[in-house]
């Protein structure tokens, strides 16, 4: 029951996380700038991974997509790649984990197969979460670096002059959404990996079937193991070959895929 709950919770947490990663990737507010020194109107500028927008105090808003790949900073391309890889891995992980859920029966799928699928999806979620966290962190670092570099960026050309406008660079909402979503996906992945351990069927202590002779306390052990009578030193029918860890009666009290005669 605890395993099913852990697996189910891991799936839900990962699902929320991946939805958050998708939302963050699509959002326009990765970074924002307030242009206080604008001589005409208050301008609020914000950028995403795919387009840049401007909003003026008059209410005018305009967004333009980055239609060229050549003019974009390599870091921005890297962030895009990390977020997309995170989404793809997360989506595949979700697909795999749906079939791995203990509460869903698909044909005669064995517990071992479900355990493997749970582990696979868990690892995918972990990598997906790490990709998202890495992507958001790289972008945040790029903003901080740009803020400090902007004071020294000025050059002249063709009689005119180009200089960086001093703006207040702030982290956009998408960065926080991305960090939280990445964290949730990571936690969900860890939960799936933990659930996998509980799903894996425990190795049975013996490979043979016990046959009890009627009327006698004798257990035949096919495959060359010692047979024991109900007398002498092995009165509790302890399995001789495994160091006497459990009695046969104790072992039989656990459900197993082996039939008992």
């Amino acid at each position: 029951m605890a395993v099913t709950a852990c697996q189910g919770l891991g799936f839900v947490v990962s699902l929320i996380g991946i939805a958050g990663i998708i939302a963050a990737t699509c959002m326009d507010q990765w970074s924002t700038q307030d242009l206080y020194n604008n001589p005409v109107t208050a301008v609020f500028n914000y950028q995403g991974l795919w387009r840049s927008c401007v909003r003026e105090s008059s209410g005018f808003t305009e967004c333009r997509g980055y239609f060229t790949l050549l003019g974009l900073p390599a870091m921005l391309q890297a962030v895009r790649a990390l977020m997309i890889v995170g989404i793809v891995l997360g989506a595949i992980g979700l697909l795999v984990s749906i079939f791995a859920l203990k509460c869903i029966r698909i044909g005669s799928m064995e517990d071992s197969a479900k355990a493997n699928m749970t582990l696979t999806s868990g690892i995918m979620f972990i990598v997906s979460g790490l990709c998202a966290i890495a992507g958001v962190s790289v972008f945040a670092n790029m903003l901080v670096t740009n803020f400090w570099m902007s004071t020294a960026n000025m050059y002249t050309g063709m009689g005119g002059m180009v200089q960086t406008v001093q703006t207040r660079y702030t982290f956009g909402a998408a960065l926080f959404v991305g960090w939280v979503a990445g964290g949730l996906t990571l936690i969900g992945g860890v939960m799936m990996c933990i659930a996998c351990r509980g799903l894996a069927p425990e190795e049975t202590n013996y490979k043979a079937v016990s046959y009890h002779a009627s009327g006698h306390s004798v257990a035949y052990k096919p495959g060359g193991f010692k047979a024991s009578t109900g007398f002498g030193s092995n009165t509790k029918n302890k399995k001789i070959y495994d160091g006497g860890a459990r009695t046969e009666d104790e072992v039989q009290s656990y459900p197993s895929k082996h039939d008992y005669v």
Partner: nanobody, 121 residues
């Protein structure tokens, strides 16, 4: 590299008219605000008129009602229609633009080299 090129300046008689143009060229993603400044000999540079991307305008008190600023966003060009010119309008007129540059993820302030307007009889 982003460049602003002013044109349309020259000698004009008092009461006359001139139309200045400022064209932005180069690898620029989006120009948001465009402004005309002027600097008379021995004086501080002052704002004449400005226009935002959305069309919001701002004029200096001394030119209100005489000058009209406009722009073409598609062509990244700004215009200043100057009517009823006075001798005190004599100055070098500079074009200024605040532009968003995706290549550096920064706002850039670009200045033109200026065009001389002389109002004299």
């Amino acid at each position: 590299e982003v460049q602003l090129v002013e044109s349309g300046g020259g000698l004009v008689q008092p009461g006359g008219s001139l139309r200045l143009s400022c064209a932005a060229s180069g690898n620029i993603f989006r120009i948001d605000t465009m402004v005309w400044y002027r600097q008379a000999p021995g004086k501080q540079r002052e704002l004449v008129a400005g226009i935002s991307r959305g069309g919001t305008t701002n004029y200096a008190h001394s030119v209100k009602g005489r000058f009209t600023i406009s722009r073409d966003n598609a062509k990244n060009t700004m215009y200043l229609q100057m009517n009823s010119l006075k001798s005190e309008d004599t100055a070098t007129y500079y074009c200024n633009a605040q532009a968003w540059d995706v290549g550096t993820i920064r706002y850039l302030e670009v200045w033109g080299q200026g065009t001389l307007v002389t109002v004299s009889a």
